[in-house]
Amino acid sequence: TPVVRKGRCSCISTNQGTIHLQSLKDLKQFAPSPSCEKIEIIATLKNGVQTCLNPDSADVKELIKKWEKQVSQKKKQKNGKKHQKKKVLKVRKSQRSRQKKTT
């Protein structure tokens, strides 16, 4: 989902090459705003380099879809782990209370 930009446009040029999902560390979409009238997409690569992507490119649109899918999957996994932790804690608590009763 596009982020609202603070300040003016960021991109001077756009990247012509194909960026692979595996090399992405972060992908930010900036929505048009009064200070910059166009959509801008800035990719942060795993090597720390930041590059502007062409918002009109079909490859970039596909990359955004894949990235968003990956992010939502990671969120689900995180939430699942939290849920499991809570269950484990509950089990441990009930075990303790049982042990106290038996002593």
Partner: antibody, heavy 124, light 109 residues
Framework: QVQLVESGGGVVQPGRSLRLSCTAS????????MHWVRQAPGKGLEWVAV????????YYADSVKGRFTISRDNSKNTLYLQMNSLRAEDTAVYYC?????????????????WGQGTTVTVSS | EIVLTQSPGTLSLSPGERATLSCRAS???????LAWYQQKPGQAPRLLIY???SRATGIPDRFSGSGSGTDFTLTISRLEPEDFAVYYC??????????FGPGTKVDIK
Amino acid sequence: QVQLVESGGGVVQPGRSLRLSCTASGFTFSQYGMHWVRQAPGKGLEWVAVISYGGDIKYYADSVKGRFTISRDNSKNTLYLQMNSLRAEDTAVYYCAREGEGSNIYYYYGMDVWGQGTTVTVSS
Amino acid sequence: EIVLTQSPGTLSLSPGERATLSCRASQSVSSSYLAWYQQKPGQAPRLLIYGASSRATGIPDRFSGSGSGTDFTLTISRLEPEDFAVYYCQQYGSSPIFTFGPGTKVDIK
């Protein structure tokens, strides 16, 4: 092949105007930021102005602010520099240069393609 | 405004020798914003290094860039006859402006 060709230079009197052009070929002009850089005779390089790929970001050196205007026509693959109120100190070779692919406010990729330059002489 | 100073002004060396060129900034510069160019007489400049240490496309590996903060270095490990030229460092400032250093001339001893 990737090429930039400047034109429009010449001899002009102080206070007059001149428009430089830079025609690009061999790459997708509309995806790259473009610069004008000048070099006075026997001197070093001086950055003049930059325009973003879409034309909405424009920055100028203090020495030309209010007198020079950078613009582009992506349908013609051409970059322009409108120079008004010319002074003797504007005498130089003017180069157009392409901003590196993906350049932004966080990471600068340098000026990776340059034209051969056009000479502007301001003299009475 | 950040001012770039290059030293030495002229470096006289022989082919095969190592050249070390210095670029000093008046304030700290992000290495993401520093580039080096080569210019031969009567020719347009050529990009050598961007991001302080990344070689531009087609640049031989005898050219290398390093440094951070206020001190940056361009090293030519073994000078070839075609490397004798003027070298400029350049930074992308926050104003934003693109400042060049005064240049270092590398000539034949």
